[in-house]
């Protein structure tokens, strides 16, 4: 008779990540009885969301549930229906929702109460929704990439998880760059954090960590596209603008409405002698790189030194991992460049011939891609430069300590992962003790 | 002020389905969401779902079982329940609020409640 | 779903006393985001509907006396009635509206010694 094979021993969990552009599922695996160790748990499944933000729906909240079906179907089919009572579903929506509750609380609450109706319907152990904050989600960022890396981790490795880390403990730092905001944190070398409200204390694994965290609402590249374009607008002298973050020959309208719904182009709006414009691309990086930089105040600051906007940033400090939109758009360009590493220098001379192209040659250059994101990398890729050098202060040197990093042995590198760990107390404060060979199973 | 009116009694055979009506009136009906519990004779309260916004969600004891409805045009909410059985003999109330978003008060405004009998 | 336990099941109280009745949750109500507990204690006289006394696990509903108040946190709640009324005989009963399915706990019946 054939042998039978013990029925695993493991635990799943689901967080759903509720961007301000789209929502993803996640679902994560791990030993039942390791669940304290480090690098144990991994992901199993990502299942995008089909449509915008769950902030998009505040209008017809009735569609929510339709919206969330696929994939929570998905989970159902992925977990053993044995486990389907005790996986938690966390889902957490971050920096859309937060503008949305800028707007209007009511609507806000309206739409995570039909959120928590529609995910309250499946048989898993579902624990509510809610919007993070943005130093939650820089946190939960930085923790994700640090546990996927082994930093945690006091036992010494002799294998490399990815082809750049470095073997010693030091932390990455985690740079995360979404549709409506952007956060950067990381560990500064013995410097006192001088903003309160940008420090953060863990103990983890059995040390201490003094952990400087900013997100920046308004930031992140959908918005502050926004941001552009409505302090672009009031210099135009028609209804045409042209602008040089888009390839020549590229056209489109847009409605002054869209334009002002946004809280972020609150500070630039004004009375328009027309209700729709249309852009119309000239393809400058230089000229689209000068207006990005308008959008980041660095006149003031009450600090030893600042990011921008007033916002205390130390020096930088280490190696740090850049995902999420950092990622999508430079994985792009590195494409592009044909799979060579780039250094900053190269990465702004291509920028330089990528924006003059013409627009109808990018399309036919690039036509399994879709027009929508294709039409806004030179925007996206400007930004992300802008941001990291003049923003965050990067240079050509630091430039080098940048890790554009998508997945890290298998898993997504966001916040979602940190976000469970915490919430199923995963993360012990000392570092656990084990047996001699109680790692002998895996690695 | 809003106000609730549940429908009247029923006296129901086992196996058969009976559905209660709650209106509002006096207030936005489509504010908050409307909430079902019960109560068996000398027992405690029981959540059996609710539903806002157009989403209806229910305890998974009833699930498969209840139906709950609402028609914001009459400002009306309804519950279903079929394959009444003996145990299902109860009160059943209708109440505004419940959820932790959009009802974040608590159940603040309760209707009368409707008495129905499963007996054979 | 989260169990809520109330004690004691029945309490007799003279007239002008304390009365305090407890409810704890299996999980926190707690919510992080605004530090509200999502609890409701609800008086349920015979006949009736029952009646919002205190939501948010503290803050007493419209039109409640005084003499209701509501304190805990995270788990543990307490509802109290610093001065018992003869209106007061009742049956109260706590619920969280922090997750679905919405749970009550199983009540305290409240009489005059």
């Known amino acids: 008779t054939q042998n039978k094979a013990l029925p695993e021993n493991v635990k799943y969990g689901i967080v759903l990540d509720a961007g301000s552009s789209h929502t993803s599922l996640y679902i994560y695996k791990w030993p039942a009885e390791k669940e304290n160790d480090t690098g144990v748990v991994h992901q199993v499944e990502e299942c995008r969301v089909k449509g915008p933000g769950i902030s998009k729906f505040v209008q017809k909240v009735n569609e929510i549930g339709i919206y969330l079906t696929d994939c929570m179907e998905r989970a159902r089919e992925v977990i053993p229906r044995s486990q389907h009572q005790e996986t938690p579903v966390y889902l957490g929506a971050t920096a859309g929702m937060r503008l949305l509750r800028m707007e209007s609380e009511e609507l806000a609450d309206r739409v995570l109460d039909v959120v928590e109706r529609s995910l309250s319907n499946y048989p898993f152990d579902f624990q509510g929704a809610r919007i993070i904050t943005g130093q939650e989600e820089g946190a939960y960022g930085w923790i994700t990439i640090n546990y996927l890396l082994g930093k945690f981790s006091q036992k010494t490795r002799w294998f490399s998880i990815v082809p750049y880390e470095t073997n010693n403990q030091e932390t990455f730092g985690a740079l995360d760059l979404g549709g409506a905001s952007t956060q950067v944190t990381f560990v500064p070398q013995n410097q006192t954090i001088e903003s309160p409200d940008n420090a953060l204390q863990f103990r983890l694994y059995g040390k201490d960590y003094n952990v400087y965290t900013h997100s920046f609402l308004c930031y992140g590249k959908d918005q502050a596209l926004w941001q552009k374009l409505a302090k672009d607008i009031q210099v135009a002298s028609n209804e045409i603008l042209r602008d040089p973050c888009f390839h020549p020959g590229y056209k489109k309208v847009v409605n002054v409405s869209d334009l002002y719904k946004t809280p972020c182009t609150k500070r630039f709006e004004m009375t328009l002698p027309f209700q729709q414009f249309e852009i119309q691309g000239i393809g400058n990086y230089q000229q689209c790189h000068q207006s990005i930089l308008e959008l980041f105040n660095t006149s003031y600051c009450p600090y030893s030194q600042c990011a921008f906007n007033g916002i205390f940033l130390p020096p930088l400090q280490g190696d740090f991992g850049a995902f999420s939109a950092f990622y999508f758009v430079m994985d792009f360009f590195k494409k592009v460049a044909k799979n060579s590493v780039i250094s900053q220098e190269k990465v702004t001379e291509m920028m330089k011939k990528f924006c003059a192209q013409p627009w109808e040659e990018i399309k036919t250059s690039y036509a399994g891609v879709k027009e929508k994101y294709l039409s806004e990398y030179c925007f996206s890729g400007t930004y992300i430069l802008s941001l990291l050098l003049q923003g965050y202060h990067f240079t050509a040197d630091s430039w080098e300590h940048i890790h554009f990093i998508g997945k890290i042995q298998g898993s997504d590198a966001g916040w979602t992962l940190g976000y469970m760990l915490n919430l199923t107390n995963m993360i012990p404060a000392e570092q656990p003790l084990s047996t001699p060979l109680s790692h002998s199973t895996y690695v | 002020q809003v106000q609730l009116v549940q429908s009247g009694a029923e006296v129901k055979k086992p196996g058969s389905s009976v559905k209660v009506s709650c209106k509002a009136s006096g207030g936005t009906f489509s504010s908050l969401p409307i909430s079902w519990v019960r109560q068996a004779p000398g027992q405690g309260l029981e959540w059996m779902g609710g539903i806002g916004f157009g989403t209806a969600n229910y305890a998974q004891k009833f699930q498969g079982r209840v139906t709950i409805t609402a028609d914001e045009s009459t400002s009306t909410a309804y519950m279903e329940l079929s394959s009444l059985r003996s145990e299902d003999t109860a009160v059943y109330y209708c109440?505004?609020?419940?959820?932790?978003?959009?009802?974040?008060?608590?159940?603040?405004?309760w209707g009368q409640g409707t008495t129905v009998t499963v007996s054979s | 779903g989260i169990v809520m336990t109330q004690s004691p099941d029945s309490l007799a109280v003279s007239l002008g006393e304390r009365a305090t009745i407890n409810c704890k949750s299996s999980?926190?109500?707690?919510?992080?985001?605004?530090?509200?507990?999502?609890l409701a204690w609800y008086q349920q006289k015979p006949g009736q509907p029952p009646k919002l006394l205190i939501y948010w696990a503290s803050t007493r509903a419209s039109g409640v006396p005084d003499r209701f108040s509501g304190s805990g946190s995270g788990t543990d709640f307490t509802l109290t009635i610093s001065s018992l009324q003869a209106e007061d005989v009742a049956v109260y009963y706590c619920q969280q509206y922090y997750l679905y399915p919405l749970t009550f706990g199983g009540g305290t019946k409240v009489e005059i010694k």
């Open positions: 999980q926190s109500v707690l919510f992080s985001s605004n530090n509200k507990n999502y």
């Open positions: 109440a505004r609020g419940g959820a932790k978003y959009a009802g974040r008060y608590g159940m603040d405004v």
